[in-house]
């Protein structure tokens, strides 16, 4: 198995400070998943990223940066329709134990008011492995540009594994994709959050196997209702 590119998979370091809503969910000091800051008290991530307790890294593109904010979180709320069998509705809200301090490096993500169409160029980011199947974890946040793929085209690859709240993205004949450790992280299109990294084939970065994301535009009501309910 050849090395699969040298970033996220086949990406590059993000422009510094360009993803101020990006967070890392840590288990102790170890990367567990990505996520996004929705507001001062809430992080959105994938339901399959659930743990008993989280340490949330915010405010720096570099894991281990002493200037970063690190906030504990012990409450998380999975979407009630999440299935550990089909992985449908793969999203979860994590409530921070204390408020995040907003700054130029810590900002709220913009939730979508509409679903972006196939062909839209988007950016997926994370601190996940840059090689697969052998892992190489970067300390700096990585980015890669991908395009939204229509459900019809994605179903040709994944058949009935694809549910209607799943979103596919990739570049034909390219390795560009997310991988282990990127789960729950953002797919941002035209400045709004359209996807959360959910799953894909393995090893990561197989050409013509798109990444699969939770389609956030289908869940804005649940996100807002859940944050309100658990204020």
């Amino acid at each position: 198995e050849e090395a699969q590119g040298d970033k996220i998979i086949d990406g590059a370091p993000c422009a510094r400070g360009s993803h101020p809503w990006q967070v890392a969910l840590l288990s102790g000091n170890q990367l567990h998943c990505g996520g996004v800051l929705v507001n001062e008290r809430w992080v959105l991530t994938a339901a399959h990223c659930k743990m008993n307790e989280y340490t949330v890294h915010l405010g720096s593109d570099t894991l281990g940066d002493r200037r970063a904010q690190r906030i504990k979180a012990s409450k998380s709320f999975r979407h009630p329709g999440y299935s550990t069998q089909t992985h449908v509705n793969d999203l979860m809200l994590v409530k921070l134990n204390s408020q995040a301090r907003l700054s130029s490096m810590v900002k709220k993500v913009r939730l979508p008011s509409r679903c972006e169409p196939p062909g839209t160029t988007c950016t997926v980011s994370g601190w996940g492995t840059t090689t697969s199947p052998d892992v190489t974890f970067p300390s700096d946040l990585m980015c890669v540009d991908v395009k939204l793929i229509s459900p019809q085209d994605c179903t040709k690859v994944y058949k009935d594994l694809l549910e209607n709240s799943m979103l596919c993205a990739g570049i034909p004949d390219s390795k560009k994709n997310a991988c282990n450790g990127d789960s729950g992280g953002p797919l941002v299109c035209r400045g709004t959050l359209q996807g959360l990294v959910s799953w894909g084939t393995f090893p990561c970065g197989q050409p013509n196997d798109p990444g699969v994301y939770t389609q956030v535009c289908k869940f804005t009501k649940w996100i807002n209702d859940t944050m309100k309910k658990h204020r």
Epitope: H32, Q85, W199
Partner: antibody
Framework: QVQLVQSGAEVKKPGASVKVSCKAS????????IHWVRQAPGQGLEWMGS????????NYAQKLQGRVTMTTDTSTSTAYMELRSLRSDDTAVYYC???????????????WGQGTMVTVSS | DIQMTQSPSSLSASVGDRVTITCRAS??????LNWYQQKPGKAPKLLIY???SLQSGVPSRFSGSGSGTDFTLTISSLQPEDFATYYC??????????FGGGTKVEIK
Amino acid sequence: QVQLVQSGAEVKKPGASVKVSCKASGYTFTSEGIHWVRQAPGQGLEWMGSISASSGDTNYAQKLQGRVTMTTDTSTSTAYMELRSLRSDDTAVYYCARAAGYGARHWYFDLWGQGTMVTVSS
Amino acid sequence: DIQMTQSPSSLSASVGDRVTITCRASQSISSYLNWYQQKPGKAPKLLIYGASSLQSGVPSRFSGSGSGTDFTLTISSLQPEDFATYYCDQFYSTPPITFGGGTKVEIK
């Protein structure tokens, strides 16, 4: 070294319970799922169920539902499989296996424990 | 549940022979099929994943093909260390993960 090391052989009486352990080393235990597969003497492989090391989510084979419990201890990177109300046809080698994949979905077993022989006999 | 049917259940072959084992799924599993080798008293070992991708460290005489419902494992030139039992499994529609019944490759 990346490996799964299982506990030793067990002999149990019908109606008893057995708990088999599987200790992971050389990789981040919480990033992967652990599955249990058994093999009766001279027979094929039978999937028993799986557990996510981080979330504790479990999926069990229908025929074992109610008799099997899978757990993990992340502080020691150990997975456990307990089987209750043992019968003679539970006599088998029990394997733990790591499923490879990324995100919510996994695709194949890339690492196996050495197996634990469980004999159920009166 | 998806049923996996392997054939033959056993075969006799000589060193240097080309050996073919088939696995049939009861419904389409795309290319999400894997092959494992198991020797007596040992745990299974992954040979092929995703129907045709060779696992790292596995000799190139092993190859896999197929998609949908019909899959094949081929050993191009059987070596003494290849005498073992071979299993397929599917990770497409899970749970449960289902295995084929196994094919025992014996010395002629």
